[in-house]
């Protein structure tokens, strides 16, 4: 009779994480008597996966009735596969004795595990940036296998090209991670914009995973200020307004200065939102010009989102023709921002 051969017909087997892997092994002879063992890896550090003779292997089941002498099929099924199970598995025939001695090994079957990448996590800069600045976004996804993966960046559906991507580790591993950094130039219209990181992998069956970052958490649009003077109905009273336009985020504090002295400080509350996501706000003062002999310099000073204050001034002429100033139609006064200067 020909000498026993151990046949492992599959050079490689690929299994999705969580599924069972079937590793095939048959022998060509019933001689010699002795157990079959399965190992992962070769050499002295090989790991015992299954021993026909003894031991408890809760994740391993034999495909056929391997306890009987006539059996020549020693295929096994390993349940609940994880990326850590990847490797080359050897079916090894032993000869019965004291001790059992290795008789012949199969050629090995390489088990690769298809593991889905984790949901991409996109993170932006720690501090806000203003339009025209370039900011970096990072995207990370972990735990996938095999190593091949595709990552794309989008801003509002438009693919970005300025990015760098690394997949780690470089060598063989049970699973891999991807890290990508994209550069995005901010514009004033980006409050409603989104940056999307899209990851495509063989395990996702054409349905890529996406991670998003809202530029509203990254951008700071500084306000534009306009101070205007409007007469009101009451004689010798002038309404001075400070229009604060197109700012984001809402966090804003406004201070009125009269000839350099703080007159009133208030925080933006009832703002109006523009279509592009920025905000507008208006504050006003009622100035009694008859109480002033000299011209008054009114300054609207705005501190936006903790940044250095910006200001706009208006010179209020009090010496000439106060009654003429008051003869124009006055703007409606809500009362909430009313300030009389005496």
């Amino acid at each position: 009779e020909e000498e026993l051969q151990v046949i492992q017909p599959d050079k490689s087997v690929s299994v999705a994480a969580g599924e069972s892997a079937i590793l095939h092994c048959t022998v060509t002879s019933l001689i010699p008597v002795g157990p079959i063992q399965w190992f992962r890896g070769a050499g002295p550090a090989r790991e015992l996966i299954y021993n026909q003779k003894e031991g408890h292997f809760p994740r391993v089941t034999t495909v056929s009735e391997s306890t009987k002498r006539e059996n020549m099929d020693f295929s096994i099924s390993i349940s609940n596969i994880t990326p850590a199970d990847a490797g080359t598995y050897y079916c090894v025939k032993f000869r019965k004795g004291s001790p059992d001695t290795e008789f012949k090994s199969g050629a090995g079957t390489e088990l690769s595990v298809r593991a889905k990448p984790s949901a991409p996590v996109v993170s932006g800069p720690a501090a806000r940036a203003t339009p025209q600045h370039t900011v970096s976004f990072t995207c990370e996804s972990h735990g996938f296998s095999p190593r091949d993966i595709t990552l794309k960046w989008f801003k509002n559906g438009n693919e970005l090209s300025d990015f760098q991507t690394n997949v780690d580790p470089v060598g063989e591993s049970v699973s891999y991670s991807i890290h990508s950094t994209a550069k995005v130039v901010l514009t004033r219209e980006d409050v409603h914009s989104q940056v999307i990181c899209e990851v495509a992998h063989v395990t996702l069956q054409g349905d890529p995973l996406r991670g998003t970052a809202n530029l509203s958490e990254t951008i700071r649009v500084p306000p534009t200020l306009e101070v205007t003077q409007q007469p009101v109905r009451a004689e010798n009273q002038v309404n001075v307004t400070c229009q604060v336009r197109k700012f984001y985020p809402q966090r804003l504090q406004l201070t009125w200065l009269e000839n350099g002295n703080v007159s009133r400080t208030e925080t933006a509350s009832t703002v109006t939102e523009n279509k592009d996501g920025t905000y507008n706000w208006m504050s006003w003062l009622l100035v009694n010009v008859s109480a002033h002999r000299d011209d008054v310099k009114l300054t609207c000073q705005v501190e936006h989102d903790g940044q250095p204050a910006v200001s706009k001034s208006h010179d209020l002429k009090v010496s000439a023709h106060p009654k003429e100033q008051g003869s124009n139609t006055a703007a409606e006064n809500t009362g909430s921002n009313e300030r009389n200067i005496y």
Epitope: E1, L30, K68, R69, N71, K96, S98
Partner: antibody, heavy 118, light 107 residues
Framework: EVQLVESGGGLVQPGGSLRLSCAAS????????MHWVRQPTGKGLEWVST???????YFPGSVKGRFTISRENAKNSLYLQMNSLRAGDTAVYYC????????????WGQGTMVTVSS | DIQMTQSPSSLSASVGDRVTITCRAS??????LAWFQQKPGKAPKSLIY???SLQSGVPSKFSGSGSGTDFTLTISSLQPEDFATYYC?????????FGQGTKLEIK
């Protein structure tokens, strides 16, 4: 159903010969090692002989040179040829299958009685 | 030859008892140990192989353990049909050898 049936036992004089047969059914006979085990009346079990799948044979010192074991796979039959019989060979002879992967005995016949006496 | 020594030679127990029979080999038999049950006038019946593997169709009240040279057969809850003679056998090395047997009797 897996079955082993022994035959050929009987009374024989010391120095005589006897051939025991074991008819196997219900399994692929050629794929199993086969064994003979005996049991003297009121005593324990004693292994007598084994024949492997490839025809290799094994005996204990007590019967070596006197007993031969053979198999005829085409007839699903196992044989034990016993020569130069002694009184000490008196026993019930069982044929058994080495049915497990490790050649452990899993199926036994009902036995046949061999008496060596003058 | 490898000697197999069983103890005790006989044992009296009651229905429902848990009993243990031991078997010692004169040298390491690498767990190639079997246990058999035999009732009067009947052929032996296989219970355990490779020291702890339950033969197909054998109830789980029978269990085997041990390694190297010392082995045990345990019957967890004796039933009337379990009263019989039990044999251990090493089949690691030719000549295969049996223990002398343990007769389990009803108390």
């Amino acid at each position: 159903e897996v079955q082993l049936v022994e035959s050929g036992g009987g009374l024989v004089q010391p120095g005589g010969s006897l051939r025991l047969s074991c008819a196997a059914s219900g399994f692929t006979f050629s794929s199993f090692d086969m064994h003979w085990v005996r049991q003297p009346t009121g005593k324990g079990l004693e292994w007598v002989s084994t024949i492997g799948i490839a025809g290799d044979t094994y005996f204990p010192g007590s019967v070596k040179g006197r007993f031969t074991i053979s198999r005829e796979n085409a007839k699903n039959s196992l044989y034990l040829q016993m020569n130069s019989l002694r009184a000490g060979d008196t026993a019930v002879y069982y044929c058994a299958r080495g049915g497990n992967w490790d050649d452990a005995l899993d199926i036994w016949g009902q036995g046949t009685m061999v008496t060596v006496s003058s | 030859d490898i000697q197999m020594t069983q103890s005790p030679s006989s044992l009296s127990a009651s229905v429902g008892d848990r009993v243990t029979i031991t078997c010692r080999a004169s040298q390491d038999i690498n767990n190639y140990l079997a246990w058999f049950q035999q009732k009067p006038g009947k052929a032996p019946k296989s219970l355990i192989y490779t020291a702890s593997s339950l033969q197909s169709g054998v109830p789980s009240k029978f269990s085997g353990s041990g390694s190297g040279t010392d082995f045990t057969l345990t019957i967890s809850s004796l039933q009337p049909e379990d009263f019989a003679t039990y044999y251990c056998q090493q089949y690691n090395t030719y000549p295969y050898t049996f223990g002398q047997g343990t007769k389990l009797e009803i108390k």
